[in-house]
Interface confidence: low
């Protein structure tokens, strides 16, 4: 590796993947194993991120870029750069402090992450319920009762009773 030449800043010529080694007369030294520098002129190399435990390696560390992690199956990333992994739940559930819980009656979640959301209220748009909602799926709204041809009928919305075994959360 070349000795740096700039009079203003002797470290400015050190390329990415190296650091300006003050202990060796400001020579550009390669980053040690398991470290990197993503920009030129660095005085230190950063330790590579280690994807351990629930994290798994999506991109290996190189001398010029950090490792990138994602989450093992059954978990999903949260935060910039996948700084956390959160447990997946099944569709029709949401993650609470006590673990995965079924969506309350009248709500649904069609993903493995996130919270249960209320079914669409078709009547607010002057429409009727065409397909009932479930824990996993929102209701499907159909045309308004006035738009239906004579003799046609829509599905009546379910009575607001709780399904057995579904306690409020």
């Amino acid at each position: 590796f070349e000795r740096t030449r700039s009079l203003q800043d002797p470290c400015s010529n050190c390329p990415a993947g190296t650091f300006c080694d003050n202990n060796r007369n400001q020579i550009c030294s390669p980053c040690p194993p398991n470290s990197f520098s993503s920009a030129g002129g660095q005085r230190t190399c950063d330790i590579c991120r280690q994807c351990k435990g629930v994290f798994r390696t999506r991109k290996e560390c190189s001398s010029t870029s950090n490792a990138e992690c994602d989450c093992t199956p059954g978990f999903h990333c949260l935060g910039a750069g996948c700084s956390m992994c959160e447990q997946d739940c099944k569709q029709g559930q949401e993650l609470t402090k006590k673990g995965c819980k079924d969506c309350c009656f009248g709500t649904f979640n069609d993903q493995k992450r996130g919270i249960c959301r209320p079914w669409t209220n078709c009547s607010l748009d002057g429409k009727s319920v065409l397909v009932n909602g479930t824990k996993e799926r929102d209701v499907v709204c159909g045309p308004s009762p006035a738009d239906l041809s004579p003799g046609a009928s829509s599905v009546t919305p379910p009575a607001p009773a709780r399904e057995p075994g579904h306690s409020p959360q």
Epitope: D9, S38, A39, G41, T44, I47, R49, A80, G81, S83
Partner: nanobody
Amino acid sequence: EVQLLESGGGEVQPGGSLRLSCAASGWAFGNYGMAWFRQAPGKEREFVSRLAWNGGSTDYVESVKGRFTISRDNAKNTLYLQMSSLRAEDTAVYYCARQRSYSRYDIRTPQTYDYWGQGTLVTVKP
């Protein structure tokens, strides 16, 4: 003792400009990367921009690219954030932070930074 002190916040109309400053003391400012984060009421702290110790590389969150410019004056131990074309969604408390020498995290995550200022409030409203 490491200290970071932000200033320059205030109330401005949409489309206006502000320049935030972060004065550092108690450590070798020129040896560390620095960043700006912001936190709107009821929201998580969000990465805004980061500048390498020597100004050699910059990063911005997508929503501020072309509007905000990060810079530093190592002789004055000061970090700056020039903000223009401000929008209502830029309203937040803005914090400067010092990048750790070593971090296992992405540079946009707060865990990458070890010292933080107290923040300066930026309010954008008509």
